[in-house]
């Protein structure tokens, strides 16, 4: 009995659902009462899901698996794994027994995009040419381990004096901290790039240091030039710093964070006290750092509606303000592909291929191409619908006339995360039913 699975690993984002495709060719007269199907972990042979005696025996894997009961009779033994975790990564064996039997193993590769790196400087005040500074680049909640690259403003790699550490949290996701020690020139730009080797996703940030002293008495309020990119559901830090005068005490500090456009109050500190959050109780200052001039704001459980500009207003004797942009993002799921019609396909038939990707933000860019990588632009209709949380579901439809055979690929790009999610379908020349393996 020939059991077929994809050669390439199935890549699934943490928290999304994954389909482990498996198909077999049923003999004429086959009935589900004859089918014995087991999904198990290849290495440990731990049972994951089974079908026997004409009945789905259910999930033995944390109740997160399901078969496709309506498709089993056509030879589709694929397994749906819900809410993928890092711990799910590995090889799954699909074992099918009727009269004859066979098995095949499919690899699940788990991935999670890294957040846009945040950059910190130490020391961060009164910098002069010749000073040694430590630049820390931090990126969070990615998987698998990242590759980290540093370069200067001219794109020249910086390899000396770099220390990178990666720590996994309880979910197995990595937080990356890379430290570069440099001696300042007259001015300089330092870029950090965090690459997810599986998603081929690059997250980068840079800091430009112009050593100089601020004029006496002036409160110079500094925020990042680039927007702060935050994934939906994660916490974001809106960085803001000011230069306290000698003898400064927190009793003198007046700090307001507000929405730039509407001037709606977000958080404040006055009369020596944190006055708390005026923004759905999701904001916090860093009280231990205020005296050093760190007025940064932590925004928890970021939502799409938080996107926009936040103003950090500091008043001591002098006053100043600066606005920082928050750009919200959510990765798109791996596209699912459907064919219509999906049976008895022949060269010359017109088929509709639908590519669907879910719960991303902001709106995606969708590209189609053939097996040779040639873009397919004609007869493409793409729609994007936002749900109540403001996340987009993307559906792109390509109409094509089948050739002898062909591969059609759909790429869904998140323009902010620079994350590409792709799916493809290969249609062979002989009469066939889709999906061949799923």
């Amino acid at each position: 009995l020939e059991v077929q699975v994809p050669e390439d690993p199935v890549v699934a984002l943490v928290g999304t659902d994954a389909t482990l495709c498996c198909s077999f060719s049923p003999e004429p007269g086959f009935s589900l009462a004859q089918l014995n199907l087991i999904w198990q972990l290849t290495d440990t042979k731990q049972l994951v899901h089974s079908f026997a005696e004409g009945q789905d025996q259910g999930s033995a894997y944390a109740n997160r698996t399901a078969l496709f009961p309506d498709l089993l009779a056509q030879g589709n033994a694929s397994l749906r794994l819900q809410r993928v975790r890092v711990a799910d990564e590995g090889s799954f064996t699909c074992f099918v027994s009727i009269r004859d039997f066979g098995s095949a193993a499919v690899s699940l590769q788990v991935a999670a995009p890294y957040s846009k790196p945040s950059m910190t400087l130490e020391p961060n005040k009164d910098l002069r040419p010749g000073d040694t500074v430590t630049i820390t680049c931090s990126s969070y909640q990615g998987y698998p381990e990242a590759e980290v690259f540093w370069q200067d403003g001219q794109g020249v790699p910086l390899t000396g004096n770099v220390t990178t550490s990666q720590m996994a949290n309880e979910q197995g996701l990595f937080d990356v901290h890379s430290i570069l020690r440099v001696v300042l020139g007259a001015n300089g730009t330092y870029s950090c790039l965090v690459r997810n080797p599986v998603l081929q996703q690059d997250a980068h940030s840079s800091v430009t240091i112009t050593p100089q002293r601020s004029p006496t008495g002036a409160v110079e309020v500094q925020v990042p030039e680039d927007p702060v990119v935050a994934l939906v559901g994660t916490d974001a830090t809106l960085r803001c710093s000011f230069s306290p005068e000698p003898g400064f005490s927190l009793a003198q500090l007046n700090l307001i964070w507000q929405l730039t456009d509407t001037k709606q109050l977000v958080h404040s500190f006055t009369e020596g006290r944190d006055q708390g959050s005026a923004y759905a109780n999701r904001t916090a200052l860093f009280p231990d750092l205020l005296a050093q001039g760190n007025a940064s704001l932590r925004l928890q459980r970021v939502r799409v509606a938080d996107e926009g500009s936040f103003t950090c207003f500091v008043s001591i004797r002098d006053f100043g303000s600066a606005a920082v942009s928050l750009q919200v993002a959510a990765p798109y799921s791996k596209p699912s592909m459907t064919l219509e019609p999906n049976k008895d396909l022949r060269p010359g038939d017109t088929v509709t291929i639908t590519c669907s990707s879910y719960r991303g933000y902001p709106e995606a860019e969708v590209f189609w191409q053939d097996g040779q990588g040639v873009p397919l632009t004609g007869n493409v209709t793409t729609s994007q619908m936002a749900n109540e949380q403001g996340l987009f579901d993307v559906h792109s439809v390509l109409r094509v006339v089948l050739g002898a055979n062909g591969t059609y690929s759909c790429l869904v790009r998140n323009p902010v995360l620079q994350q590409d999610a792709h799916g493809s379908v290969t249609i062979t020349g002989q009469p066939m039913t889709f999906p061949p393996e799923a």
Epitope: P215, T216, G217, A218, N254, S315, R317, D318, F319
Partner: nanobody
Framework: EVQLVESGGGEVQPGGSLRLSCAAS????????MGWFRQAPGKEREFVAA????????YYAESMEGRFTISRDNAKNTVYLQMSSLRAEDTAVYYC????????????????WGQGTLVTVKP
């Protein structure tokens, strides 16, 4: 001790413009934030606008933003208030002040005050 002298007040018709000046002496002008306040007859003194020491940040009362512009020339130790589209309700004595610790819009944050200059808006 800082001394402040306002000038440029006078009578103007509705819709007209006026530029007030405030000259400072007796301190390091370029290290102070400065503000303008006004007091209409029979009313309390109210905040108009403030400017940071180097002029990079400004702060306005909401009702005056767009019509009034605060600026400064640190070389001349002078702060200015350009007023346009003036209305009858802008009639008041306008004061300039040197900011101390606190919010720019609060009178209690200011350490030194001028004597004021009268602006009258009438047809």
């Amino acid at each position: 001790e800082v001394q402040l002298v306002e000038s440029g007040g006078g009578e103007v018709q509705p819709g007209g413009s006026l530029r007030l000046s405030c000259a400072a002496s007796g301190g390091t002008f370029s290290s102070y934030a400065m503000g303008w306040f006004r007091q209409a007859p029979g009313k309390e003194r109210e905040f108009v606008a403030a400017i940071s020491s180097e002029g990079g940040s400004t702060y306005y009362a909401e009702s005056m933003e767009g019509r009034f512009t605060i600026s400064r020339d640190n070389a001349k130790n002078t702060v200015y208030l350009q007023m346009s589209s003036l209305r009858a309700e802008d009639t008041a004595v306008y004061y300039c002040a040197v900011k101390g610790v606190g919010w720019p819009q609060e009178q209690a944050s200011y350490d030194y005050w001028g004597q004021g200059t009268l602006v009258t808006v009438k047809p």
